[in-house]
């Protein structure tokens, strides 16, 4: 299994993946396979009304660039000295022995997985293509026969099955074949989007590819600068009883998704008032309605808030309210 995979994003469309070779490979590593797929946003983002008081906006950050080759080790340090440098405690004899045992176990387990869990598949041609993966058959553990090697306990393996696993949509993920290096720049990704990346080490190229168990890592691309800006005009219509209907277009390709809109409006000479329009409300109304406005000239600005933060305010839109109707709510049905 490739070791210590780390992923970072250096732009809104790229993720850099780095890893270390397996510690005890079965033969020579000829190449690595990297697969990636978009991850859906958390379901709670669709459920919660982020306009409700006390509800914090969801925090989503992209994967920051590497500080240094060993930046990931920072979290594992035993302590920090006054200069902020990190040092590990010296290893005891028992720790060294334990690591040797783990290394030996890992090799045995990888041999088992290699020979039993995976059926070899023919080499895929090309790079960066859609992966048809017709001949690679990943058996479920439920298909594995009785074994004598030391492996983590899995209850009652039934007899080995010779039936092939049906093709699933997962088998059409984009992938890249990496030769002679332990890094890859994945390009052409969607901005501010989470990706699940699968990394495999392979020790045979032709005629049949033999690859390790996958190592997984997740990363999110960086936000796109103007993706959360509302494009086009904010339009309005004044209905009877001075109900003002404001309408705008949602950003076409936001950073993640839009969770709310802020509507900022003010009557000439008064202070600004703010209104929050939830994702759900906007989906039904395609805007919002203002009621109970005192007569006068008004200006309105709107901005969207996505998983990455706020977009820009729109240019002000102006309208004139002629008379006053005392309606308690500012946002109408």
């Amino acid at each position: 299994v490739p070791l210590d995979p780390i992923s970072v994003s250096n732009s809104s469309s790229q993720i850099i993946l780095k890893w270390k070779p397996p510690s005890d490979p079965n033969g020579n590593i000829t190449h690595y396979l990297v697969f990636w797929e978009r991850q859906a946003e958390d379901s709670e983002l669709f459920e919660l009304d982020y306009c409700l008081k006390g509800l914090k906006l969801p925090s989503r950050t992209w994967s920051p660039p590497f500080e240094s080759e060993d930046s990931q080790k920072h979290n594992q340090s035993e302590y920090e000295d006054s200069a902020g440098e990190c040092c590990s405690c010296p290893k005891t004899d028992s720790q060294i022995l334990k690591e040797l045992e783990e290394s030996s176990f890992r090799k045995t387990f990888e041999d088992y997985l290699h020979n039993v869990v995976f059926v070899p598949r023919k080499t895929s041609s090309g790079t960066g293509a859609e992966d048809p993966r017709p001949s690679r058959k990943r058996r479920s553990l439920g298909d594995v026969g009785n074994v004598t090697v030391a492996v983590p306990t899995v209850a009652a393996f039934p007899n080995t099955s010779s039936t092939s696993v049906p093709t699933s949509p997962e088998e059409h993920r984009p992938f890249e074949k990496v030769v002679n290096k332990e890094s890859l720049v994945i390009s052409g990704l969607r901005h501010f989007t989470g990706y699940r990346i699968e990394l495999q080490a392979c020790n045979q190229d032709t005629p049949e590819e033999r690859c390790s168990v996958a190592a997984y890592v997740s990363a999110r691309t960086m936000p796109e600068a103007k993706a959360d800006d509302i494009v086009g005009p904010v339009t309005h219509e004044i209905f009877e009883n001075n109900v003002v209907h404001l309408m705008w277009q949602e950003p076409k390709e936001p950073n993640g998704l839009i969770v709310l809109y802020e509507v900022s409006y003010r009557r000439y000479g008064d202070e600004e008032l703010h209104l929050c329009v939830s994702r759900k409300h906007f989906a039904l109304e395609r805007g919002c309605r203002l009621r109970g406005l005192s007569p006068g000239n008004y200006s309105v600005r709107i901005r969207a808030t996505s998983l990455a933060g706020n977009g820009s305010w729109t240019e002000p839109t102006y309208f004139y309210v002629t008379d006053y109707l005392d309606v308690p709510s500012n946002i109408a049905k």
């Epitope: 669709f46 219509e237 009883n241 109900v243 309408m247 759900k280 039904l284 395609r286 805007g287 049905k333």
Partner: antibody
Framework: QMQLVQSGAEVKKPGESLKISCKGS????????IGWVRQMPGKGLEWMGI????????RYSPSFQGQVTISADRSISTAYLQWSSLKASDTAMYYC????????????WGQGTLVTVSS | SSELTQNPAVSVALGQTVRITCQGD??????ASWYQQKPGQAPLLVMY???SRPSGIPDRFSGSRSGNTASLTITGAQAEDEADYYC???????????FGGGTQLTVL
């Protein structure tokens, strides 16, 4: 492209239960309201209700409140219309439609599901 | 009232202009949408908001609103415009929607 695909025609007896479906694709199903519309033979369109799959918030027309149940499963991008006890008067074409374009406006429609209730 | 009233039937000579109307108190505070339905087909959105057409809808279709009446106008009616037309808006409560009874348009 944007699509709503409804389940096939149904023939039922009075008193039976039924659940018809509408599968959305090509858009964010969870964050778009979806509704149901009835059209009885030779008659006009009747607005039944709408649901927001994101949190299953549902709004029924007073005429259909308690008569049907609208639900959605966002994990499979599917909305449902359900009856616990059908009547002959439920015989109709039922359309699902997505609220899009503008407020409360159905911009995309399913092909319709014909429900026939007869003894 | 939360009802929307339409003329049951209207006819127009080929190439002429026809106006289909929809009346209801709620139209004083809400936009109307218009749908075209041909026999055996699902309805099709042809007009929404003040005067907005979805892509693919010919520009001979236009919309307007005055007081409690919304109108759909077809300027230079074509044979393929022969269909039932339904208006749709919110009811007066604002919590539900409602369709008009429909207008059958015949192109002579």
């Amino acid at each position: 492209q944007m699509q709503l695909v409804q389940s096939g025609a149904e023939v039922k007896k009075p008193g039976e239960s039924l659940k018809i479906s509408c599968k959305g694709s090509g858009y964010s199903f969870s964050s778009s309201w979806i509704g149901w519309v009835r059209q009885m033979p030779g008659k006009g369109l009747e607005w039944m209700g709408i649901i927001y799959p994101g949190d299953s918030d549902t709004r029924y027309s007073p005429s259909f409140q308690g008569q049907v149940t609208i639900s959605a499963d966002r994990s499979i991008s599917t909305a449902y219309l359900q009856w616990s006890s059908l009547k002959a008067s439920d015989t109709a074409m039922y359309y699902c439609a997505r609220v899009g374009a503008s407020g409360w406006t159905f911009d995309y429609w399913g092909q319709g599901t014909l429900v026939t209730v007869s003894s | 009232s939360s009802e929307l009233t339409q003329n049951p039937a209207v006819s127009v000579a080929l190439g002429q202009t026809v106006r289909i109307t929809c009346q209801g108190d709620s139209l004083r505070n809400y936009y109307a949408s218009w749908y075209q339905q041909k026999p055996g087909q699902a309805p099709l959105l042809v007009m929404y908001d003040r005067n907005s057409r979805p892509s693919g809808i010919p520009d001979r279709f236009s919309g307007s609103r005055s007081g409690n009446t919304a109108s759909l106008t077809i300027t230079g009616a074509q044979a393929e415009d022969e269909a039932d037309y339904y208006c749709n808006s919110r009811d007066s409560s604002g919590n539900h929607a409602v369709f008009g009874g429909g207008t059958q348009l015949t192109v002579l």
